[in-house]
């Protein structure tokens, strides 16, 4: 059980553009191609203005137009659903595909692109009816735009809605080494696929990926709950016969000062394999990047059933130690170190100010809204207050 | 010990509705996709529904799509099974597996509950 | 629909010969550089086993002497050194493309 981490099922929750809890400051836009069409018409449902935002320029042959909702703090923006332009039930511009991009500062953007590098995303067959794309991997973002395309000159415009959830973590970045191939009956790539930092080197760093998409492995690491993905996908993993020190170090930067009460590694153990849990965890804290590593590290030596092959978390205590940056180092007690997922159990501490984009506004933890039921590609059954937005259809 | 064992079945009238549950353990049910699959009186093999691991994607063949309603309660640990306006054809024997949404099949099964659909 | 036609549909082995089945896709059952294709075993009374993975991974516990290869549309599974304890009907799936299918299966006896 991964406590302290967010549960992907409880992150569907629209985010406020249909609701109007994003208020219209938040969003804004390349361009208008008139104030009836501009950024803040670009509600999901809604048939303000001329009924969506329709950008100025032609987003063909250069895809340059772009809509941008602020969501002021950092969510795990798990769907989209798209529209085209209401008009009264007369419009008839809408976007076959469309690209996202994606900041949390503000400053570095990312290009969002599915679990096999695609960043193309399907759109609308028409005006009206809404298009959910589930993000697979799903991204931790404040500042989402959304890029039009077509594939010849036209009109397009669109209406949005984004489902997550707050990202409670408060986890920025982690630092980590490349992850690496294993040779069984087939290769084994046990690479962070999905990492949106910095790769120099042999290490990854200032970004965010598979060990924080709240997605836990199986007990059996070749395998994957993920449709048609390599084997590994799941894991990111390390041999020992390259860290001669005997151990993987990484490094984690959160947004403000925490209390850290605990750190949950998702290991895998299926030893017969070569994955073995780690067998100890040290950890070092920080509050600045700049900063001295401050008093005795964090120690813990891993007990418990090592034989049992499952896959587990392994809760590590950290002893409330207050920190911005931790460093922790993952002891070899076998031939591979093979984690999913790490999550971290802390409390901000009080008059800490958050380390990106100024002071952000209070946001509750849930978003008010369920996800619209009038999906017209993909059946929708909120159940309740389960934030559920259920796709019904092929699975590939 | 991983271990999934199916209830519910029976002799049912055709048009008639009838719902099966699968109880699962040994294993963490909330990461893993489940599946049914039917075996006919001939022997062949048919996956009728599948699930993700969180329960927000379904999918469904054409032959039972509408018909059948696949669902689960990862607090319960079980996998069900709603078959409404059945047919001769839904004859057979139905299975609960683990996994169809993934990239590796299906690694456990249950040991499958008999229906008949006959009047 | 992807329709999977095993070959032969019964097959009798001398126990310590080798067994060999083959499975053939109507199209490509590789995505991305894998194959979705598993075999699985059925004795009579019991729900099937999963056997091979992916074309050529063989499942936790199972003996080694079952392996599997192929790929896009053509696989086998071959048992080394047949015993009795192998007879079963044996079953290949694709899950590449919806609807996943099965193929009709083979029946491995004992000559």
């Known amino acids: 059980d991964m406590k302290g981490h967010f549960d992907p099922a409880k992150c569907r929750y629209a985010l406020g553009m249909q609701d109007r809890t994003i208020p219209d400051s938040d969003i804004s836009a390349s361009s208008s191609w008139s104030d009836s069409t501009a950024a803040r018409h670009s509600r999901l449902e809604s048939s303000d203005g001329d009924g969506a935002w329709c950008p100025a320029g032609s987003v063909f042959p250069k895809e340059e137009e772009y809509l941008q909702v602020d969501l002021q703090r950092l969510h795990l923006v798990a769907l989209v659903g798209t529209q085209g332009r209401h008009a009264g039930g007369l419009g008839k511009e809408f976007s076959r595909s469309y690209r996202l991009r994606y900041s949390r500062d503000g400053r570095r953007w990312m290009g969002w692109k599915d679990r096999w590098g695609q960043e193309v995303i399907s759109g609308n067959e028409d005006p009206e009816g809404v298009v959910l794309k589930d993000l697979g991997p799903p991204m931790v973002a404040r500042l989402v735009r959304f890029y039009p395309r077509a594939d010849r000159v036209m009109s397009v415009c669109l209406r949005v809605e984004l489902y997550g959830c707050l990202w409670r973590d408060g986890l920025l970045s982690y630092t980590a080494p490349v992850g690496q191939t294993m040779y069984l009956s087939e290769a084994v790539y046990l690479n962070d696929s999905t990492y949106d930092g910095h790769t120099v080197g042999g290490l990854q760093y200032g970004g965010l990926g598979q060990l924080a998409d709240g997605v836990v492995g199986l007990d059996d690491f070749r395998k994957s709950q993920e449709l048609r993905v390599w084997p590994g996908y799941d894991y990111v993993g390390w041999s020992n016969h390259s860290f001669s020190s005997g151990y993987v170090e990484m490094e984690f930067e959160f947004d403000r000062l925490r209390a850290f009460q605990a750190m949950q590694v998702h290991c895998n153990n299926m030893h017969t394999l070569g994955a073995r849990l780690p067998g100890g965890v040290e950890c070092r804290f920080r509050r600045g990047p700049a900063m001295a590593w401050e008093g005795e590290p964090m120690r813990h030596n891993l007990g418990g059933n090592l034989g049992d092959p499952r896959a587990r978390a392994v809760s590590v205590p950290l002893g409330g130690r207050v920190a911005r940056f931790l460093q922790c180092r993952f002891l070899f007690a076998g031939p591979w170190l093979l984690f999913s997922e790490i999550s971290f159990i802390s409390d901000v501490v009080n008059n800490s100010s958050p380390a990106l984009g100024g002071t952000f506004p209070p946001a509750p933890w849930w978003p008010p809204g369920p996800p619209p039921t009038n999906f017209s590609s993909l059946e929708l059954e909120p159940r309740g207050q389960q934030p559920v937005a259920k796709a019904e259809g092929s699975p590939t | 010990e991983v271990q999934l064992v199916e209830s519910g079945g029976g002799l049912v009238q055709p048009g008639g509705s009838l719902k099966f549950s699968c109880a699962a353990s040994?294993?963490?049910?909330?990461?893993?996709?489940m599946s049914w699959v039917r075996q006919t009186p001939d022997k062949r093999l048919e996956l009728v529904a599948i699930?993700?691991?969180?329960?927000?994607?379904?999918y469904y063949p054409d032959s039972v799509k509408g018909r059948f309603t696949i669902s689960r309660d990862n607090a319960k640990n079980t996998l069900y099974l709603q078959m409404s306006s059945l047919k001769s054809e839904d004859t057979a024997i139905y299975y609960c597996a683990r996994g169809g949404y993934g990239n590796y099949g299906m690694d456990y099964w249950g040991q499958g509950t008999s229906v008949t659909v006959s009047s | 629909d992807i329709v999977l036609t095993q070959s032969p549909a019964s097959l009798a082995v001398s126990l310590g010969q080798r067994a060999t089945i083959s499975c053939r896709a109507s199209e490509s059952v590789d995505s991305y550089g894998n194959s979705f294709m598993h075999w699985y075993q059925q004795k009579v009374g019991q729900p099937p086993k999963l056997l091979i993975f992916?074309?050529?991974n063989i499942e936790s516990g199972i003996p080694a002497r079952f392996s599997g290869s192929g790929s896009r549309t053509d696989f086998t599974l071959t048992i080394n050194s047949v015993e009795a304890d192998d007879v079963a009907t044996y079953y290949c799936q694709q899950s590449n493309e919806a609807p996943y299918t099965f193929g009709g299966g083979t029946k491995l006896e004992i000559k």
């Open positions: 699930i993700n691991s969180h329960g927000f994607s379904t």
């Open positions: 992916r074309a050529s």
């Open positions: 040994g294993f963490t049910f909330s990461s893993y996709g």
